[in-house]
């Protein structure tokens, strides 16, 4: 695959130029129906590239993708803030970019999970993502679609900050979840989910190692390392926000 250079701030006379789409949903609204890599520019943000998934529900921005273990997800706060990985493969879009897309709006968060037997699960949440001043806290703003949500995400109204090994914001005082597990995540009590954990191609024998994997407790269990995950976000219209 071609190498992607780091985005730079282009200096040009904006007055004669057309505004880039703010997100994947806006691309969908102007008639784009093909999924793929697009350039967007949320309000107040420099332009950046995103994977858009166009569906019958509109345009969704892919914010995370895991499927082969090619990218190390055990990274510090600044990496999770800025984003990392390969837009054609495994990546984390970056908390600041995601927040620039959602702004102050409530959003739909879709989580696609796949196990090693080819089974798949799709979960949808209504969420609000805070800015860096809240440690990018994720707040559930409505009940979860499906049966798997109740013990996986915070109860409606409770915010869970994002944590990494070097920025511990989890809800446990006695433990640094990101350090004892792996990767950065909205860790509550360390045991409900972690889609940014270590990628295992085969199941390790030691439970101590296994707990560091990619898991979603209420689907395949706490100690089942998932084969693939994708997270997508779609801001709701401003009037839909509470």
């Amino acid at each position: 695959l071609p190498e992607m250079a780091q985005p730079v701030d282009p200096a040009h006379n904006v007055s004669r130029l057309h505004r880039l789409p703010r997100d994947c949903q806006e691309l969908f609204q102007v008639g784009e129906r093909q999924s793929g890599l697009f350039e967007i520019q949320p309000q107040g943000s420099p332009p950046f590239l995103v994977n858009c998934k166009m569906t019958s529900d509109g345009g969704w921005t892919v914010i995370q993708r895991r499927h082969d273990g090619s990218v190390d997800f055990n990274r510090p706060w600044e990496a999770y803030k800025a984003g990392f990985g390969d837009p054609h493969g495994e990546f984390w879009l970056g908390l600041e970019k995601v927040h620039s897309i959602t702004g102050d709006r409530n959003s739909r968060l879709a989580v696609q999970l796949r196990d090693w037997d080819g089974n798949a699960e799709l979960l949808q949440f209504s969420v609000h993502l805070g800015g860096e001043d809240t440690a990018y806290s994720l707040q559930l703003t409505a009940p979860v679609a499906g049966q798997l949500g109740a013990t996986t995400v915070p109860p409606s109204g409770l915010s869970v900050p994002f944590s990494t090994w070097d920025q511990d914001h989890d809800l446990r005082r006695d433990k640094n979840c990101a350090k004892s597990l792996s990767g950065g995540w909205w860790f509550g009590t360390c045991s409900h989910s972690n889609l940014n954990g270590q990628y295992f191609r085969s199941i390790p024998q030691q439970r101590q190692k296994l707990k560091k994997g990619i898991f979603w407790k209420t689907w395949r269990g706490r100690y089942y390392p998932l084969q693939a995950t994708t997270m997508l976000i779609q801001p709701m219209a401003a009037e839909a926000a509470s």
Partner: nanobody, 122 residues
Framework: EVQLVESGGGLVQTGGSLRLSCAAS????????MGWFRQAPGREREFVAG????????FYGDSVKGRFTISRDNLKNTMYLQMNSLKPEDTAVYYC???????????????WGQGTQVTVSS
């Protein structure tokens, strides 16, 4: 849609340089990703370089990395390919393309223009 015309090709010696241009007509040029592709005689068309609408992100094929530089001037509706340290294997017809999506696979495009011939002699 954007209409495209390539120019700047020619005959150059090994180690030399050329600058290709791709002039676009049509509205909203800065919303479009632009790419350079090439096709040598008897070979498949291949991706050379690409640039996002704002110019903020660039992409290069492995064979040209470090030698070619893609750029664009959104006020002039023009994209450029600066080709340095040219080799005989760079000899090909060079084409430009545009799309809303970032596309590096030439098979995803339907229509191709005339292109501009680049010949590198040894």
């Amino acid at each position: 849609e954007v209409q495209l015309v390539e120019s700047g090709g020619g005959l150059v010696q090994t180690g030399g340089s050329l600058r290709l241009s791709c002039a676009a007509s049509g509205r909203s040029f800065n919303l479009y990703y632009m790419g350079w592709f090439r096709q040598a005689p008897g070979r498949e068309r291949e991706f050379v370089a690409g640039i996002s609408g704002s110019g903020g992100s660039t992409f290069y094929g492995d064979s040209v990395k470090g030698r070619f530089t893609i750029s664009r001037d959104n006020l002039k509706n023009t994209m450029y390919l600066q080709m340095n340290s040219l080799k005989p294997e760079d000899t090909a017809v060079y084409y430009c393309q545009s799309s809303r999506r970032i596309i590096t696979n030439p098979r995803e495009y339907g229509y191709w223009g005339q292109g501009t011939q680049v010949t590198v002699s040894s």
